[in-house]
Interface confidence: medium
């Protein structure tokens, strides 16, 4: 698997992973204790033809062009968890692994 990495200075228009730091305090999410902010990343850009398409199905659907189908979108194709310290529903503070919190790779799907 392959994905492009960009930054705020990139001129790349194709589907790319960009850095993004999420700040929970700025959201007012005080039930998250740590980390108060983390590197989440995000996907943005155009999906032309077969560029970075994760599944052959994506290309085939686009070719067949059934009614109501949209073109492929730039979306996470690989994500990873982070460890967080947070209040659970029972007012306990828990240290736990939360899945799919970080975008590791972007592609077209």
């Amino acid at each position: 698997d392959f994905g492009l990495d960009c930054d705020e200075h990139s001129t790349e228009s194709r589907c790319c992973r960009y850095p993004l730091t999420v700040d929970f305090e700025a959201f007012g999410w005080d039930w998250i204790i740590a980390p108060k902010r983390y590197k989440a990343n995000y996907c943005s850009g155009e999906c032309e033809f077969v560029f970075l398409q994760k599944y052959p199905h994506t290309h085939l659907v686009h070719q067949a062009n059934p009614r109501g189908s949209a073109g492929p979108c730039c979306t996470p194709t690989k994500m990873s968890p982070i460890n967080m310290l947070y209040f659970n529903g029972k007012e306990q503070i828990i240290y736990g692994k939360i899945p799919a919190m970080v975008v590791d790779r972007c592609g077209c799907s």
Epitope: P35, I94, V102
Partner: antibody, heavy 125, light 107 residues
């Protein structure tokens, strides 16, 4: 290398408020990846976590002490403080300040490292 | 609060001995456990984090194992500087709690 140094009175009278300060040297207390805490150890006994505070002022306390504990941060002095009200002889202990580190990748957390050298507080009239 | 029970509370051993200290948690804490060494008049020093990872600068004779509710600190060959009190710490659920300590003395 970050160093933590506790300061405050060594003797407090029963029913009064114990006040301690921890000064952080060699690093900024405002760094977003660090949390600051207090741990105590009564003479000849084990360790008890008192609470932890973030530089923004968010604090989390041990429920067993919560009604008596207040922690605060003074970023201008690179210090954080502990106040423990209505003390009794059972609060006689060595009080340590500590640092926690939470990596913004969310993959590596480091509890209670480093520690201050500890300061002895005796509650007695 | 999660209770951490250490055993034994004290032990006597000789230089070169293999020493094992156990820590039991009152509920599942995954791998969220550290081991600390404390010498008289000094602040504790962390030896092991995440149940089995060796702190940088700590001799390899120290090792940790376990997960869930049962954990072990092993000193493979006790050295004169290892005579101290050892504490486990759970950091799975607030409040963080320590074991009551194991004092390792010279036989």
């Amino acid at each position: 290398q970050v160093q933590l140094v506790e300061s405050g009175p060594g003797l407090v009278k029963p029913s009064e408020t114990l006040s301690l300060t921890c000064t952080v040297y060699g690093g900024s207390i405002s760094s977003g990846n660090y949390y600051w805490g207090w741990i105590r150890q009564p003479p000849g006994k084990g360790l008890e976590w008192i609470g932890t505070i973030y530089y923004s002022g968010s604090a989390y306390y041990n429920p067993s002490l919560k009604s008596r504990v207040t922690m605060s941060v003074d970023t201008s002095k690179n210090q954080f403080s502990l106040k423990l009200s209505s003390v009794t002889a059972a609060d006689t202990a060595v009080y340590y300040c500590v640092r926690d580190y939470y990596d913004s990748s969310g993959h590596y957390y480091n509890w209670f490292d480093p520690w201050g050298q500890g300061t002895t507080v005796t509650v007695s009239s | 609060a999660i209770q951490m029970t250490q055993s034994p509370s004290s032990l006597s051993a000789s230089v070169g001995d293999r020493v094992t200290i156990t820590c039991r948690a009152s509920q599942d804490i995954r791998h969220d456990l550290g081991w600390y060494q404390q010498k008289p008049g000094k602040a504790p020093k962390r030896l092991i984090y995440a149940a089995s990872s060796l702190q940088s600068g700590v001799p390899s004779r120290f090792s940790g194992s376990g997960s869930g509710t049962e954990f072990t600190l092993t000193i493979s060959s006790l050295q004169p500087e290892d005579f101290a009190t050892y504490y486990c710490l759970q950091h799975n659920t607030y409040p963080w709690t320590f074991g009551q300590g194991t004092k390792v003395e010279i036989k």
